[in-house]
């Protein structure tokens, strides 16, 4: 399995209810990535263990997060897999989707890169303690 997580994870709001998540393949020894797994959810849903899962093939390093709801903070993390198995998840990245009147024009929704974000548990199931 890949030894490290995808790097350079960024999440950016590109429409009022749609974000673009992008990333780069894991660092380290040459590893052929066959699939990426993207987990995302609002902070409240994440704490409750109600995440959404997207899969993207190994040549693709972008995905859309759609139907986001203004006023929520969304958490995103990504792992890479190959024929051996799944590697570790990236640090979590948060995106705050602001109400429309504050996200237009020159206002920019808060976006954190993975280097700035809190590190949460790498497991799919997260309990409440891991979010505090």
């Amino acid at each position: 399995a890949p030894a490290g997580p995808p790097v350079g994870v960024k999440v950016t709001l590109i429409e009022d209810d749609t974000a673009l998540v992008s990333w780069k393949p894991p660092d380290g020894p040459e590893t052929v990535v066959t699939r990426y797994t993207i987990l995302y959810a609002s902070r409240k849903a994440w704490i409750a263990g109600e995440w959404q899962v997207l899969h993207r093939e190994g040549a693709i390093t972008m995905a859309l997060l759609e139907n986001l709801v203004a006023g929520n903070v969304y958490i995103v993390k990504i792992s890479a897999s190959n024929e051996v198995g799944e590697g570790p998840f990236s640090n979590s990245v948060e995106l705050a989707v602001l109400p429309k009147e504050t996200s237009e024009s020159n206002q920019r929704p808060k976006r954190l890169d993975s280097a700035d974000a809190k590190v949460y548990s790498g497991y799919y199931h997260l309990d409440q303690k891991s979010m505090t």
């Epitope: 429409e15 997207l54 993207r56 693709i60 995905a63 237009e104």
Partner: nanobody, 123 residues
Framework: EVQLVESGGGLVQPGGSLRLSCAAS????????MHWVRQAPGKGLEWVSS????????YYADSVKGRFTISRDNSKNTLYLQMNSLRAEDTAVYYC????????????????WGQGTMVTVSS
């Protein structure tokens, strides 16, 4: 079938300006969000900016914020990107695009129909 034709690219010195245009035909241009994306030589596609159907919501990538301005004229079915204070790292082919809404695991997020317009920033 959507047809998009980008124009306005060229060679410009660092600090210079260009205005890109994207003429659309064959679709209800005024009812869709539109995006500018770019691809630098040897690199992947990078999202640059977006504008809502009526122009009231606008977003920019951090790398261009404060330097680029997106706009549209629905009466002319045309999308624009005013690029100021250009830098060498802005060198790329620029495309106008729409988001592709498809959950296939092999899809890419943007539908790019045009040939793009090359912007080269060099002294």
């Amino acid at each position: 079938e959507v047809q998009l034709v980008e124009s306005g690219g060229g060679l410009v010195q660092p600090g210079g300006s260009l205005r890109l245009s994207c003429a659309a035909s064959g679709s209800a241009f005024g009812s869709h969000w539109m995006h500018w994306v770019r691809q630098a030589p040897g690199k992947g596609l990078e999202w640059v900016s977006s504008i809502s159907s009526g122009g009231s919501s606008i977003y920019y990538a951090d790398s261009v914020k404060g330097r680029f301005t997106i706009s549209r004229d629905n009466s002319k079915n045309t999308l624009y990107l005013q690029m100021n204070s250009l830098r060498a790292e802005d060198t790329a082919v620029y495309y106008c695009a729409r988001v592709r809404r498809d959950d296939d695991s092999n899809y890419r997020p943007f539908d790019v129909w045009g040939q793009g317009t090359m912007v080269t920033v060099s002294s």
